[in-house]
Interface confidence: medium
């Protein structure tokens, strides 16, 4: 569909005569009839197959014709057509004299014709006006013409229909050849597919409008390139959705069991060395001068009772000093100037001469010790408490205060690792020398029976159209990650495609 446009420029009839040679009275009141038809090698009378148009009276004798000229006429003249433009045409332009106001053919005398021109040729669709001029013995007509397409028609022959749109069915404008040109942010054959946010993950993200990035189940982040770990995962990460891969030093189904208490909590004080010894269990090896489960207590150097023979100990900045009783000397009052004659043994100790009476030795009764039986026996000096237990004197006896995880008189027994029921999903726990072992029921595996194996919701391949299946361990259900173009809990529905368009 298009329009043949004819622009009349100038008509010259200097003598004001008709084609017969007869002059017009008082002058030739000139109007035009135009006939457009298919190409003929010799233009002949007959139907105006492409259309006809007439003008009102445009002037007298010689005159120039302006755009949208006065008198109600349209210039350029419009000859619309509703077919594919063939690229060739024939054109007949007749100039007539109107003696009165009635311009109908039957109302005019037969000799009212002033001039008649006929041309034929090639004409491509385009904006350019093609200039032409025809001269006869008495008249001259200058005009130009072109063919343009109607609104929404495009191409070399105005045969291609294209209507711009910006709605659910497409987002485009039309190019000069009728092809679609997508609006910014849209792509696809009919410009229906939004262009997602730059960098939006191809599989894990999608969009319903341009510059958007919506995440499929199991994915998160601005570009949908971060997986969502298992619900409740504390100290773990994932590489695919719903995983919980524990960070170093953590264990358990949700990576919430601390396997590296030393690093995470630094419990040992005063420069002590920390050793992990199980879940939330540790041992501190104290530096000299410190004691306590966490080496939090500072030892006085006199606490070890270094002064013998009843010597009294005095703490000093750089150590300690023994004040010896009469008859003793040395760093620890270990040397005696006494003999058995001086009755040096206390608390009922019996004296024995040595080195021909130059020295002696005391044999102490139970509960007393020291070179002169001057000290009550400290039952803790032998460090009887195992596994870092703390020894406490209780009168004539002693007792051990055990660290968590140990029991027994001397803290020599491990509290059963199985007491905490560490095996998940009904697993059976076995205490071992260095830890425990879980025997898992059918359908579970892993150190603590935390991994489901046989009950796999994805095993039945529930997802359609090449979707990726993920098992949600916490609910025994599956999640389908749909490829582009499919929706539904199992990706079973194709996204509705538009009806095909005629262009």
């Amino acid at each position: 569909s298009g329009v043949f446009q004819l622009q009349l420029q100038e008509f010259i009839n200097e003598r004001g005569v008709l084609a017969s040679g007869r002059p017009c009275e008082p002058g030739c009141r000139t109007f035009f009839r135009v006939c457009l038809k298919h190409f003929q090698a010799v233009v002949s009378p007959g139907p105006c197959t492409f259309g006809t148009v007439s003008t009102p009276v445009l002037g007298t004798n010689s005159f120039a014709v302006r755009d949208d000229s006065s008198g109600g006429g349209r210039n350029p003249l419009q000859l619309p057509f509703n077919f594919t433009w063939p690229g060739t045409f024939s054109l007949i332009i007749e100039a007539w004299h109107a003696p009165g106001d009635d311009l109908r053919p039957e109302a005019l005398p037969p000799d009212a014709l002033i001039s008649k021109i006929a041309i034929q040729g090639s004409l491509a669709v385009g904006q350019n006006w093609l200039l032409d001029e025809q001269t006869s013995t008495l008249t001259r007509l200058r005009y130009s013409y072109r063919v343009i397409c109607s609104d929404n028609y495009y191409g070399d022959n105005c045969s291609r229909l294209c209507k711009k749109r910006n709605d659910h069915f497409g987002h485009y404008v039309c190019q000069p050849d009728g092809n679609l040109s997508c609006l910014p942010g849209w792509t696809g054959e009919y410009c229906q597919q939004p262009i997602c946010l730059s960098g939006c993950h191809e599989q894990n993200g999608y969009c319903s409008k341009p510059a958007e990035c919506l995440c499929r189940p199991g994915w998160q982040g601005r570009l949908c390139n971060e997986c969502i770990p298992h619900n409740g995962c504390r100290h773990g990460t994932c590489s695919t959705p719903w995983q919980c891969t524990c960070d170093e030093g953590w264990g358990g189904l949700f990576c919430d069991q601390d396997l590296n208490y030393c690093t995470h909590h630094s419990p040992c004080k005063n420069g002590a060395t920390c050793s992990n010894s199980g879940q939330r269990s540790y041992t501190c090896t104290c530096r000299p001068g410190y004691t306590g489960v966490d080496c939090e207590l500072e030892l006085s150097e006199c606490d070890s009772n270094p002064c013998r023979n009843g010597g009294s100990c005095k703490d000093q900045e750089d150590g300690y000093h023994c004040l010896c009783p009469p008859g003793y000397y040395g760093l620890h009052c270990e040397h005696s100037t006494l003999s058995c004659a001086d009755s040096p043994c206390f608390n009922g100790g019996s004296c024995r001469e040595r080195n021909q009476g130059a020295n002696y030795a005391c044999e102490c009764p139970p509960n007393f010790t020291g070179s002169n039986c001057e000290k009550k026996v400290d039952r803790c000096t032998s460090n009887p408490c195992a596994n870092g237990g703390q020894c406490l004197n209780r009168g004539p006896s002693r007792m051990c205060r055990c660290r968590p995880g140990f029991t027994g008189t001397y803290c020599e027994l491990h509290v059963s690792d199985c007491a905490r029921n560490p095996c998940a999903h009904g697993g059976t726990c076995h205490d071992l020398e260095n830890g425990l072992m879980c025997t898992c029921p059918a359908g579970f595996s892993g150190r603590r029976c935390e991994v489901r194996t046989s009950i796999d919701a994805c095993a039945s391949s529930p997802c359609f159209n090449r979707a990726t299946c993920y098992t949600d361990l916490s609910t025994d259900t599956f999640v389908c990650n749909c490829p582009y173009g499919f929706v539904g809990s199992r990706c079973e529905f194709p996204v509705g495609l538009p009806p095909s368009f005629p262009w």
Partner: antibody, heavy 121, light 110 residues
Framework: EVQLVQSGAEVKKPGASVKVSCKAS????????MHWVRQAPGQRLEWMGW????????KYSQKFQGRVTITRDTFASTAYMELSSLRSEDTAVYYC??????????????WGQGTLVTVSS | QSVVTQPPSVSAAPGQKVTISCSGS????????VSWYQQLPGTAPKLLIY???KRPSGIPDRFSGSKSGTSATLGITGLQTGDEADYYC???????????FGTGTKVTVL
């Protein structure tokens, strides 16, 4: 890209004829009018005539009427200008020029490179 | 005798402005569009201005055109040495039914 490529320089004797060609490309040949314009050494531009490439209709300047013939070959997209009865004052550069037309007159928008015609005995 | 006349020459220093007039009549300039062409030495003319005041793509805005009655004017601002050329106006003459060109103006950059 619109291009008009003309034939090479010619040397002619007085009384002879010369035919200059102008090959068009980069646009629809039949949708435009082709003008011919000449320029004698040190002189202004002088319009000679035009041809409607769609239907072959021609219009000539009164100064050259009877001596100039403009034709076209639509299949070769080429226009021709033939000038006969050459005289020494016809020595000039001859240009073909494409014309666009609108309601206010024609507009020469692209020119050939020119062809020098020398008329000398 | 030409129907459209121009001054033979104009000159100005670099960076200055020059104007070239084109004088005609009602049968040409007054009732038809005017075009301006630049012809550098030894080359074909090149379209500078069409439809009185429009510039084709690639022509800098230093070149401008205007029309009033039977006269048209070409203005060149920020004159450059590369602007040294002959400048012609062109229009349609209805009475001659012919394309007509002005007599041409040589622009010299001092």
């Amino acid at each position: 890209e619109v291009q008009l490529v003309q034939s090479g320089a010619e040397v002619k004797k007085p009384g002879a004829s010369v035919k200059v060609s102008c090959k068009a490309s980069g646009y629809t040949f039949t949708s435009y009018t082709m003008h011919w314009v000449r320029q004698a050494p040190g002189q202004r531009l002088e319009w000679m005539g035009w041809i409607n490439a769609g239907n072959g209709n021609t219009k000539y300047s009164q100064k050259f009427q009877g001596r100039v013939t403009i034709t076209r070959d639509t299949f070769a997209s080429t226009a021709y200008m033939e000038l006969s009865s050459l005289r020494s004052e016809d020595t000039a550069v001859y240009y073909c020029a494409r014309s666009r037309y609108n309601s206010g007159g024609s507009l020469v928008d692209y020119w050939g490179q020119g062809t020098l015609v020398t008329v000398s005995s | 005798q030409s129907v459209v006349t121009q001054p033979p020459s104009v000159s100005a220093a670099p960076g200055q402005k020059v104007t070239i007039s084109c004088s005609g009549s009602s049968s040409n300039i007054e009732n038809n569009y005017v075009s301006w062409y630049q012809q550098l030495p030894g080359t074909a003319p090149k379209l500078l201005i069409y439809d009185n005041n429009k510039r084709p793509s690639g022509i800098p805005d230093r070149f401008s055109g205007s029309k009033s009655g039977t006269s048209a004017t070409l203005g060149i601002t920020g004159l450059q040495t590369g602007d040294e050329a002959d400048y012609y106006c062109g229009t349609w003459d209805s009475s001659l039914s012919a394309e007509v060109f002005g007599t041409g103006t040589k622009v010299t950059v001092l």
